[in-house]
Interface confidence: medium
């Protein structure tokens, strides 16, 4: 999947653009909005009817090296009595994000953008039908 | 920076950390080959905390289109299909990394940007605070 070029209908390429070798792009990995934080104080992952846990995956050859993945705690959903309702299902909600992968080929290093799918949390859904026959 | 394990036979001049600026291949590798997007495509309708999806478009960003979830109700849908206001529909938010064209309008020069997106909604029991 290639990054689309800027369409001429929108912009004229400025003269100030840095020179870039063919087939590659320049990427500054100093993150804009680096200090933005999601408020985790409301602990919705424990209060949800489809609760989840978080696990941190660590990869030193990836930037960012830490990616947090959610895992649904149950198959069913938690009802008002705190019991698992097995007619409903806890399902993962997923979102794509970008990471930079550092690859070692002998002593040389190359960088590759990657799309990764992150499980963000879980929601409670009704299955379409009960049985497929 | 992030420390990277090196081949011991390589020259010491190699930077162990991710450099501030890197040249990357224009092709993006997709790690999500074993997922079935159709499976989750209608969760927004079938959830007990359903949501609508709003298109957010920005040609200076990659991906240029991001879908934002907005919970349809304050409460959650009960077994009878009615909204139960004893429960709350709340958005699940996630920080994701996108590419921002920098300098603006440049075709092959980007900077990573962290943005907060609402991905979907989940039904939670409210924490009851009584104001005396």
């Amino acid at each position: 999947r290639k990054i689309p070029k800027v369409g001429h209908t929108f912009f004229q390429k400025p003269e100030s653009c840095p020179p870039v070798p063919g087939g590659s792009m320049k990427l500054d990995i100093g993150i804009i909005n680096e200090n933005q934080r999601v408020s985790m104080s409301r602990n919705i992952e424990s209060r949800s009817t489809s609760p989840w846990n978080y696990t941190v995956t660590w990869d030193p050859n990836r930037y960012p090296s830490e990616v947090v993945q959610a895992q649904c705690r149950n198959l069913g959903c938690i009802n008002a009595q705190g019991k698992e309702d097995i007619s409903m299902n806890s399902v993962p909600i997923q979102q794509e994000t970008l990471v930079v992968r550092r690859k070692h080929q002998g002593c040389s290093v190359s960088f590759q953008l990657e799309k990764v799918l992150v499980t963000v949390g879980c929601t409670c859904v009704t299955p379409v039908i009960h049985h497929v026959q | 920076g992030i420390t990277i394990p090196r081949n011991p036979g390589c020259p010491n001049s190699e930077d162990k950390n991710f450099p501030r600026t890197v040249m990357v291949n224009l092709n993006i590798h997709n790690r999500n080959t074993n997922t079935n997007p159709k499976r989750s495509s209608d969760y927004y309708n079938r959830s007990t905390s359903p949501w609508n999806l709003h298109r957010n478009e920005d040609p200076e960003r990659y991906p240029s289109v991001i879908w934002e979830a907005k919970c349809r109700h304050l409460g959650c849908i009960n077994a009878d299909g009615n909204v139960d206001y004893h429960m709350n529909s709340v958005p699940i938010q996630q920080e994701i990394l996108v590419l921002r064209r920098e300098p603006p309008h440049c075709p092959n020069s980007f900077r990573l940007e962290k943005i907060l997106v609402s991905v979907g909604c989940t039904c939670v029991t409210p924490i009851v605070h009584h104001v005396a």
Epitope: Q71, R73, I86, S87, N89, V128, H130 | -
Partner: antibody, heavy 123, light 106 residues
């Protein structure tokens, strides 16, 4: 076609642990839940629990919490059920059984079964 | 947990007979499934959602009932129907099965 192939019979001493495997083929392993059912000396079936390889979600029958641990290795399309602190009453045939996908069918709809693994606990 | 009680625990009938097995739940359930387990074999889904015939199951098998009382009927018993039959509720966690009804041919 869908196949669930379980590991062979086990004889264990009281207090030991045993791990039974269930290798799935003929479908996308990640998309369906896997359940485990105990059958003691040809009698009543007891549902032990189920696991969703995709979300990591697990549901246990309270009677088996602390006794059984369900895990999966998605890269090997294999589900595992480990029994700890074995006692004579754990002697039984243990079945893995495929559940629904949570999308078309409910997670708890069991359709295909493994051939069963006999676990004998004897001193 | 919802307790499932089957009756009879065992029965013997002749080929061609109409056979009825009942299952009583300790509290009301929405769905009942029935499994057939032939000697030395794995359980096989026979009836799902109380009355729907699973794929490949002969039409002589039928299911009915609601609330706490459910029935599995074989309209004309065949030699290959020798098996143990289990009811299973799919309403409340955990899934629970009846103790089984062993069916033999006279």
């Amino acid at each position: 076609q869908v196949q669930l192939v379980q590991s062979g019979a086990e004889v264990k001493k009281p207090g030991a642990s045993v791990k039974v495997s269930c290798k799935a083929s003929g479908y996308t392993f990640n998309e369906y839940t896997m359940h485990w059912v105990k059958q003691s000396h040809g009698q009543r079936l007891e549902w032990m629990g189920g696991i969703n390889p995709n979300s990591g979600g697990v549901s246990y029958n309270q009677n088996f919490k602390g006794k059984a641990t369900l895990t999966v290795d998605t890269s090997a399309s294999t589900a595992y059920m480990e029994l700890s602190s074995l006692r004579s009453e754990d002697t039984a045939v243990y079945y893995c059984a495929r559940g629904g996908d949570g999308y078309y069918t409910n997670y708890f709809d069991i359709d295909y079964w493994g051939q069963g693994t006999t676990v004998t606990v004897s001193s | 947990d919802i307790q499932m009680t089957q009756s009879p625990s065992s029965l013997s009938a002749s080929v061609g007979d109409r056979v009825t097995i009942t299952c009583s739940a300790s509290s009301s359930v929405n769905y009942m499934h029935w499994y057939q387990q032939k000697p030395g074999k794995v359980p096989k889904l026979l009836i799902y959602d109380t009355s729907k015939l699973a794929s490949g199951v002969p039409s002589r098998f039928s299911g009915s009932g609601s609330g706490t009382d459910f029935t599995l009927t074989i309209s004309s018993l065949q030699p290959e129907d020798v098996a143990t039959y289990y009811c299973q509720q799919w309403n409340s966690h955990p899934l629970t099965f009846g103790q089984g009804t062993k069916l033999e041919i006279k």
